[in-house]
Interface confidence: low
């Protein structure tokens, strides 16, 4: 799916109002410095491509994110603010259901969601110059992490 026609401001609003909080809830009990951000994105469409991939595509060690609250809200945001997105996801969703295993929060899933948090923050600051993983440690990160 080509994310270039999405209503980025609306998706950003959905992230700030709900998705970010659900990501934090999922990561509760995990230190913000525990995982290094190895996935990045260069612009908003690219960020959404990466976000979709990490959220909905089962990966080795983490096949259970698609039913998490943040994932369902991400799907809703993309379905409404990206014209034509929902049609492209019907077959993908069916395949995902077959591949999904029991809902278990593994360390690999926590790492994957940590990467998602980084991608979402990049999505919200698309004009930020890339400086490797350090640009995920900005002042506003305190709004997105629990420190335990």
């Amino acid at each position: 799916y080509d994310f270039t026609n999405c209503d980025f401001e609306k998706i950003k609003a959905a992230y700030l109002s709900t998705i970010s909080k659900d990501l934090i809830t999922y990561m509760s009990g995990t230190k913000s410095t525990e995982f290094n951000n190895t996935v990045s994105c260069s612009n908003r469409p690219h960020c959404l491509t990466e976000i979709q991939s990490l959220t909905f595509n089962p990966t080795a060690g983490c096949a259970s994110l698609a039913k998490e609250m943040f994932a369902m809200k991400t799907k809703a945001a993309l379905a409404i603010w990206c014209p034509g997105y929902s049609e492209t996801q019907i077959n993908a969703t069916q395949a995902m259901k077959k591949a999904r295993k029991s809902k278990v929060t593994t360390n690999k899933c926590l790492e994957q969601v940590s990467q998602l948090q980084g991608l979402w923050r990049r999505f919200n600051r698309p004009l930020l110059k890339q400086q490797g993983s350090s640009d995920y440690k900005d002042d506003d990160d305190k709004h997105h992490h629990h420190h335990h």
Epitope: C6, D7, A14, M72, K75, A76, I80, C82, E87
Partner: antibody, heavy 121, light 105 residues
Amino acid sequence: EVQLQQSGPVLVKPGASVKMSCKASGYTFTDDYMNWVKQSHGKSLEWIGIISPYNGGTSYNQKFKGKATLTVDKSSSTAYMELNSLTSEDSAVYYCAREDYDYDGYAMDHWGQGTSVTVSS
Amino acid sequence: QIVLSQSPAILSASPGEKVTMTCRASSSVSYMHWYQQKPGSSPKPWIYATSNLASGVPARFSGSGSGTSYSLTISRVEAEDAATYYCQQWSSNRTFGGGTKLEIK
């Protein structure tokens, strides 16, 4: 107060086209999507499609692709739906409905009063 | 496209009775909305996202369900509840159920 004011009833001949309007007020027009829904006499609701006044992006029910065209005029906060090649099957009441994010789900929270379209020779 | 099937098509109840109508989806959906429509009027949002009552909806209404099966229940039916109720999903585009017409005896 959110209001959606739809254009009046129309009587058209088979094969003709019709363009109906839905004027929005009481909220920022570009903040929410606009749905169009068909209701034939005594029948259920049928979703036609959705448009984003923000970027003009549309998504259609496969059944109505080629039949309905959704557009908006941001300057007048008005959504339009054009139906072409009309037949008696298109005789129905057509609603516009604003869609907003509420309670973890996008719902059609405000509806227009409906535009009645009668196709008859 | 996800198909929503509502049952029963017509439901007849006496005032004070408890009634339940169901909505089944052809594949799993995240949430279900419900709308009420009376003859000659536009549909009104009635229950948001499976279980949240819209503004002004009496507390005798409730909604529940998950996956492919959802329901709307009225604990004690009143005459003013006579209407057609439609379920609607948005997980994959948007579709409505065929409606359940509630008649009061």
